[in-house]
């Protein structure tokens, strides 16, 4: 199109994360995808100073079609904050990200204590949990809820029926798979929820309950229906 | 049947390089983070490396930090170990060790399945 | 580092006799979930270490009853309550908290 545009983000979401604490030797990707007209050029800052491939042992990528910088087998003095500029002759963005290089003993995912937390809420009603991790090594998170099948919670092999319900995926942000929200609530959404997270050294996980009370002014019509009788 | 396979191991000179494989069968390799171990002769049991599922995480022990690079290709169920300047105190048994998965837990997260193990000597 | 300690060296039993093996971690292995991560093998000759009790008390799969894992935080054991002549070789704990994951020196057990 002839429709001249100063450079703009194309994707925030990818940029939201801006504190990078990544393990030592392992690889950082910063991403900028950006969009305008003509198409813009991008290029990197350390520290607020241009970023050349002599300034690290073994150099850096740049993916110019992914907008994104590529550091592999980082070590202590990459730390620092990267700066990409996108710009073309109609203006310029640019957008930093802080990189901490973790040379601590990196260890299996930490759940804080009490979360998440047992909940009660009327049928229709709406519930949240909340898990908070924290993991040197980037942790994948589940949100699991244990099932009946054919009335029993366990299988014929003594393991728990799962059913995932929310894990974390390409659009998913760590604040959002931190949080499962459960609408408009059932009497079948009550029982036990667990919290997941795994990472390269292991796998953690919390559970709380959920209970389901009958809504106010329902209960005769509760009482009188057999699939709510003990 | 869940099974771990190294090869690659030999005898080589200080200095030198080696590359290990291990080749996974029996579960989804890709769900799982994997280990090296190594055991020198008569000596006890020496963690070495851990990479997670994906390949985006790495750690190392002290003693092959610089030299030794695991790395893994999930599309041939194959885990790596290259050995750079090797050492004589490098001399073991390398076996291959599964990590943790991505899933619930049905038992051990991981450390349960081990190679039979591939014999390095570093020699001159 | 977490530094593991094992006691005894090695161990003679009189088969159908009890044998107890310490392992002692210079950290607490309590982890935040509430589970403790150590975790117990035994390698017989010429073969890879074999799980026997992961998560300070579960028996694995396969794993005799006779084998039980107890302790907390620090401290930990083995037991076997009878031992029978298969239960030869070396046995291991680790701890599975932290990266580098450390093993205990090993404790070799033999029959009289």
């Known amino acids: 199109s002839n429709n001249k545009r100063a450079p703009y983000w194309t994707n925030t979401e990818k940029m939201e994360k801006r504190l990078h604490a990544v393990p030592a030797a392992n690889t950082v990707k910063f991403r900028c995808p950006a969009g305008g007209n003509p198409m813009p050029t991008m290029r990197w800052l350390k520290n607020g100073k241009e970023f050349k491939q002599e300034h690290r042992i073994g150099g850096y990528k740049v993916r110019n079609q992914h907008w994104s910088l590529i550091m592999e087998s980082v070590v202590p003095s990459d730390k620092g904050n990267y700066t990409c500029v996108v710009e073309n002759e109609y203006g310029s963005i640019n957008h930093t990200y802080h990189l901490d290089v973790v040379e601590r003993s990196p260890h299996r995912p930490i759940l804080q204590a009490g979360l998440p937390a047992n909940a009660s809420t009327v049928v229709g009603g709406d519930v949240e949990f909340v898990c908070k991790v924290y993991s040197d090594a980037q942790p994948h998170i589940q949100w699991i809820k244990h099932v009946e099948k054919n009335g029993s919670k366990y299988g014929p092999d003594g393991l728990p029926y799962l059913k995932v319900l929310k894990a974390a995926g390409v659009n998913t942000t760590d604040k959002e798979i931190e949080v499962l929200y459960i609408r408009n609530v059932t009497f079948e959404d009550a029982g036990e929820y667990t919290c997941l997270a795994g990472n390269s050294i292991g796998i953690s996980f919390h559970s709380a309950w959920l209970t389901v009370l009958p809504a106010p002014g329902r209960e005769k019509e509760i009482t009188a229906s057999p699939d709510y009788l003990e | 049947e869940v099974q771990l396979l190294e090869s690659g191991g030999g005898v080589v000179q200080p200095g030198r390089s080696l590359r290990l494989s291990c080749a996974a069968s029996g579960f989804t390799f890709s769900s799982y983070a994997m280990h090296w171990v190594r055991q020198a002769p008569g000596k006890g049991l020496e963690w070495v490396a851990v990479i997670s599922y994906d390949g985006s995480n790495k750690y190392y022990a002290d003693s092959v930090k610089g030299r030794f690079t695991i790395s893994r290709d999930n599309s041939k169920n194959t885990l790596s170990l290259q050995m750079n300047s090797l050492r004589v105190e490098d001399t073991a048994i390398y076996y291959c060790v599964r990590g943790a998965g991505r899933g619930y837990p049905y038992g051990p997260d991981g450390f349960d399945i081990w190679g039979q193990g591939t014999m390095v000597t570093v020699s001159s | 580092d977490i530094v593991m300690t094992q006691t005894p060296l090695s161990l003679s039993v009189t088969p159908g006799q009890p044998a107890s093996i310490s392992c002692t971690s210079s950290?607490?292995?309590?982890?935040?979930?509430?589970?403790?991560?150590v975790y117990w093998y035994v390698q017989k000759s010429g073969q890879p270490p074999q799980l026997l009790i992961y998560?300070?008390?579960n028996r694995f799969s396969g794993v005799p009853d006779r084998f039980s894992g107890s302790g907390s935080r620090t401290d930990f054991t083995l037991k076997i309550s009878r031992v029978e002549a298969e239960d030869v070789g070396v046995y291991y704990c680790m701890q599975y908290v932290e990266v580098p994951l450390t093993f205990g020196g090993g404790t070799k057990v033999e029959i009289k």
């Open positions: 998560e300070l008390s």
């Open positions: 950290r607490s292995l309590l982890h935040s979930d509430g589970k403790t991560y």
